[in-house]
């Protein structure tokens, strides 16, 4: 018996087609993705093949103006229209709190939304009961397929799930649900979830009874053969993990932003064992036409967005590199721009001894969600910025000891190379890392811009000195694992909305050309 699994993950509000780098579509003939194009391909496969599931592995929420304006209603509407069979909750589904998940999505979705490792407690338990499920058994052709969901246990550090949701260890929570499905004679089980590729592989290895793992969160691109676009494969598709009980378990993910549709064919024997698995992500490029009815619906929903944010704020004459491939690995000019805007927004001439009260900015690279292409006449709009900074956060002022900052920069590279969001972009700081050293001892130079000076210059960080730093509220609250900031900050004052800070700076500067200038170096 053959099953076709179609899957998406980390779509992040890319309802409309995008440029190849998943930023706003500029040249329509070269644009990719979007729900109208996705629907065309899904329908084509559904017509051609008998046993098809369309699954999403989380993080539909957050990423463009669509989410800023519609707050998840757009996700429910268009996923319903595409007839998704199931979705796993991602960390970003909690960005507007639990209410922002329940009302627009959980109550409106016509498909099951899954997570086995999220447990509700207190008054929320009865309110959310039945709105998301640990597993779902679906009829597929003449067979049944069990789908168990999971969500990153790091979600409380990454989003706003509140205090009444407990995020358990994925493997610990999944095993009893899979065991239950087995006792109910479900012998074909997919783990669908949002914890990242490393956890996906662990689930495949450790959870007895899981036949296939469909993941998300790490934006992992897997491909067998010559990849069709710019993404470099992290491994073959599917990635095969040998489980502890000796089974070959296919693990898949489909990059992000709706650029690809994951396509996996699994052959099962009569006992539900995987005999074979093969496939590849399908690049949703312009060779696939956009479905006219979905496109018309997109255009109808689009009207509200146009009024919101299409005015030009200023111009860029350089490419603003906000790609995760840059900002999570090295100094990127989008990070520099944002940090410069953050400092500029906090210019307060204190007295004759200080040129300013604050000179330093840190910004988690994972918070930069899109680049901006200068080839659209250089125009920058609020809409463009909303794709870069979609989280609706604030840029806050904190006071920290030098020792805390040093810990933060060690944390920045403690697991360097995994495309994780904690890699710091900076302003008013020069940092040098030596990645050959062990985690926790990789910062070899950390110089900070003086404030008590008439001519600003860089001096070595002093461990016992107290510094003011501008940073996202996300970091002030210990997000992306920066618990040391939350635990050790001496003062915290909330600031202005992130997009507004950057838009004001761009409007003020009129023309911008941020460079990569050696703020972050590797020895």
């Amino acid at each position: 018996w053959e099953l076709t699994i179609l899957h998406t993950n980390d779509v992040h509000s890319r309802l409309e087609q995008t440029s190849e780098d998943s930023s706003k579509c500029v040249n329509a003939s070269r644009c990719m993705g979007g729900v109208a194009r996705l629907f065309t391909k899904v329908q084509q496969i559904r017509r051609a093949e008998p046993n098809v599931l369309l699954l999403d592995a989380g993080d539909q929420y957050q990423g463009t103006i669509w989410f800023t304006v519609y707050k998840g209603a757009e996700v429910a509407h268009f996923m319903n229209a595409l007839r998704y069979d199931a979705m796993a909750l991602g960390n970003h589904e909690f960005d507007n709190g639990v209410e922002g998940l329940i009302e627009p999505l959980l109550k409106e979705a016509k498909f099951p939304i899954l997570s086995a490792n999220i447990k509700a407690k207190g008054p929320l338990a009865s309110q959310i009961s039945g709105l998301y499920l640990p597993y779902k058994v679906l009829p597929v052709g003449d067979e049944v397929v069990g789908i168990v969901g999971y969500t990153s246990k790091e979600t409380p550090f990454l989003s706003n799930p509140g205090t009444n949701l407990v995020f358990e260890d994925e493997i610990t929570a999944l095993q009893p649900e899979v065991d239950k499905l087995k006792t109910l004679n479900v012998n074909k089980i997919i783990a669908l979830g949002h914890s990242g590729f490393e956890t996906d592989k662990l689930i495949a290895q450790k959870v007895r009874g899981v036949d296939v793992v469909v993941g998300g969160h790490s934006n992992t691109f897997l491909y067998t053969g010559n990849p069709p676009s710019k993404e470099v494969p992290a491994g073959k598709y599917p990635f095969i993990v040998t489980s502890d009980d000796g089974r070959k378990v296919p693990v898949v993910q489909a990059y992000a932003f709706g650029k690809y549709l994951g396509y996996l064919k699994i052959e099962f024997d009569e006992r539900g064992n995987v005999i074979s698995s093969h496939g590849n992500p399908i690049l949703l490029n312009s060779s696939i036409p956009e479905d006219p009815s979905i496109k018309a619906d997109i255009n109808k929903w689009r009207i509200k967005l146009d009024n919101y944010s299409t005015q030009e704020l200023g111009k860029t004459i350089v490419y603003l590199d906000g790609s995760s491939q840059s900002c999570r690995f090295r100094e990127c000019n989008m990070g520099n721009l944002i940090c410069d805007a953050m400092i500029n927004n906090n210019l307060r001439h204190a007295d004759e001894m200080f040129w300013n009260h604050v000179s330093m900015c840190i910004l988690n690279g994972g918070g930069i969600r899109s680049p901006i292409d200068e080839r659209n006449n250089g125009t920058i709009t609020w809409e463009n910025l909303a794709a870069v900074l979609p989280f609706g956060g604030t840029f806050d002022l904190v006071q920290l000891k030098g020792s805390t900052l040093k810990k933060a920069f060690e944390h920045s590279v403690h697991r360097y190379g995994q495309s994780t969001g904690e890699f710091l972009q900076v302003g008013g700081i020069h940092v040098v890392y030596d990645l050959s050293r062990k985690p926790g001892d990789r910062v070899v130079k950390l110089d900070v811009l003086c404030t008590k000076c008439r001519v600003p210059s860089y001096d070595p960080l002093k461990m016992d000195e107290i510094y003011k730093v501008i940073l996202p509220n996300f970091l002030a609250n210990g997000g992306d694992g920066f618990q040391m900031i939350k635990d050790e900050l001496l003062r915290h004052d909330s600031g202005d909305q992130d997009i507004n800070v950057v838009s004001t700076y761009i409007s003020k500067m009129k023309v911008i050309y941020p460079a990569v200038e050696g703020r972050i170096k590797f020895s």
Epitope: V137, D142, N185
Partner: antibody, heavy 119, light 107 residues
Framework: QVQLVESGGGVAQPGRSLSLSCAAS????????MHWVRQAPGKGLEWVAL????????YYADSVKGRFSISRDNSKNTLYLQMNSLRAEDTAVYYC????????????WGQGTLVTVSS | EIVLTQSPATLSLSPGERATLSCRAS??????LAWYQQKPGQAPRLLIY???NRATGIPARFSGSGSGTDFTLTISSLEPEDFAVYYC?????????FGPGTKVDIK
């Protein structure tokens, strides 16, 4: 032990409605698909409808599609069959049945309730 | 819709004899075929599922075989309590059909 007890049968006029219930016990009701199967007097078995364990899917025989509606209340361990626009040919004993393994077997049957459609 | 045909309509045998009941499908039903026994005034009872698996508590004298379109229920040595009506049943795409039944009576 598994028990299925049907109720609600009786006499109804053609074109009228009737509602059957089935009280389940002895197993985790919310884990199992449930069916209604009927048997006209002196005739064979005829499958009527299936409802998924969580009520997310329903399937019907062509002979009742659009007239009958299967539903369940997992909090009350109860299965229902709402029968509208009844016809003489709907006269039968109606059995409540538990699905044993995703439709490959119907493993526990109630004793049935008689529905008579007559003017 | 898949139609099931059972033969013979009636099988007259004596206790201790072997009974062979046939069920033919109008198209392939894979392995999803079950057999039920019904005695007068009682609800049906599951005997065999997935063509050849005996249900819990069913004596070993009952066995099922076949695949695709042709299936057989065999009672190796009829006991007095085995005289009843036997139905085959299939499911295809979640639509279920029963055969018309075979009556096994005492000769």
């Amino acid at each position: 032990q598994v028990q299925l007890v049907e109720s609600g049968g009786g006499v109804a006029q053609p074109g009228r409605s009737l509602s059957l219930s089935c009280a389940a016990s002895g197993f985790t009701f919310s884990d199992y698909g449930m069916h209604w199967v009927r048997q006209a007097p002196g005739k064979g078995l005829e499958w009527v409808a299936l409802i998924w364990y969580d009520a997310s899917f329903e399937y019907y025989a062509d002979s009742v599609k659009g007239r009958f509606s299967i539903s369940r209340d997992n909090s009350k361990n109860t299965l229902y069959l709402q029968m509208n626009s009844l016809r003489a040919e709907d006269t039968a004993v109606y059995y409540c049945v538990r699905e044993g393994q995703w439709g490959s077997r119907l493993d526990y049957w109630g004793q049935g309730t008689l529905v008579t459609v007559s003017s | 819709e898949i139609v099931l045909t059972q033969s013979p309509a009636t099988l007259s045998l004596s206790p201790g004899e072997r009974a062979t009941l046939s069920c033919r499908a109008s198209q392939s039903v894979s392995r999803y075929l079950a057999w039920y026994q019904q005695k007068p005034g009682q609800a049906p009872r599951l005997l065999i599922y997935d063509a050849s698996n005996r249900a819990t508590g069913i004596p070993a004298r009952f066995s099922g075989s076949g695949s695709g379109t042709d299936f057989t229920l065999t009672i190796s040595s009829l006991e007095p309590e085995d005289f009843a009506v036997y139905y085959c049943q299939q499911r295809s795409n979640w639509i279920f059909t029963f055969g018309p039944g075979t009556k096994v009576d005492i000769k």
